[in-house]
Amino acid sequence: EVEKTACPSGKKAREIDESLIFYKKWELEACVDAALLATQMDRVNAIPFTYEQLDVLKHKLDELYPQGYPESVIQHLGYLFLKMSPEDIRKWNVTSLETLKALLEVNKGHEMSPQVATLIDRFVKGRGQLDKDTLDTLTAFYPGYLCSLSPEELSSVPPSSIWAVRPQDLDTCDPRQLDVLYPKARLAFQNMNGSEYFVKIQSFLGGAPTEDLKALSQQNVSMDLATFMKLRTDAVLPLTVAEVQKLLGPHVEGLKAEERHRPVRDWILRQRQDDLDTLGLGLQGGIPNGYLVLDLSMQEALS
């Protein structure tokens, strides 16, 4: 078939409107001016173009902006965003939170695609840190976003942003990530009173050290078993039976059901059986009476 390059008479687009959906691909290429398209990008999303047609429009914008689109165009990409590659997006400089929201809205309901991940990365790097408004926006669209970041990336989250984090945002975080987030949360919530503080800090406790758990045990917090099971094993091991009892309050009875799972299993092995018996839960596996416990790690440190 002969390549059609000239725009047919009377078909030159004067504006971006619905009539263009009936243009064939070659007609769009020939009859739509790229500069006109760029200035009227806000109209594109309201017109039901096929993705085939959107490919043509994207090609026109790529030719007009080989170094990357300006933010005035990016903000109005709409469904055209779903035709962008991560390589395209790496050329962009997105600084406005409104632009970010507009593009995330297009992808709403879908998994985080490589394009979206690249967009977020460009945006956060441009801002220098993950501020509260950005974090609010990202976790609203992708609850698991925070846990997709490396510990190094999380280190750029300012403590003030922690207020935006909801418990479900931390569901998939691993201990290394919580190790980074916990001190920030502790700092963010430090001026709250006991019970309010515990409600806020609870979902971050997977990063808490032993001394903080000991302090919490003195505050009648009644930690639930689900939270206890997410604590760092190395932080739980030094706790005494009395401290765990105080920490869990009425939930201490739940230890029996978890006695074969970490960190409960490992903690039981470190306790005197006599002490475990005081709980009246039938926990077994503690150190028998009369046995001496040598802490070899202490011995090595001394020698």
Epitope: P48, F49, T50, Y51, E52, L54, Y79, L82, K83, G109, H110, E111, S113, P114, Q115, V116
Partner: nanobody, 119 residues
Amino acid sequence: VQLVESGGGLVQAGGSLRLSCAASGRTFSSYNMGWHRQAPGKERELVAVISSGGSTYYADSVKGRFTISRDYSKNTLYLQMNSLKPEETAVYYCYAQGYDYDEGYGMDYWGQGTSVTVS
């Protein structure tokens, strides 16, 4: 997204046909859908579109004679064609916008087409 057209056939000039396009797969309601046709030896052309919001658009040549609609409960797109003309003999294809979940790209899904012959 899989699309299967039906309802084509042989009809006399001035007659009517109703084409159906059954969609299976993800998010039927979320995207624009439409009908294209391709006559023998001609380029494919868009006939009618219904947007995700329910707005309808028609090629000038079919306005007032063709009606596009969709039934969300049946995941089906329709094209009611009245006062058919011999020059509208073509294979009619339905399409739906979709989303490639593996690649993260928007794309068009097409049916295999249903043949309409107007004598």
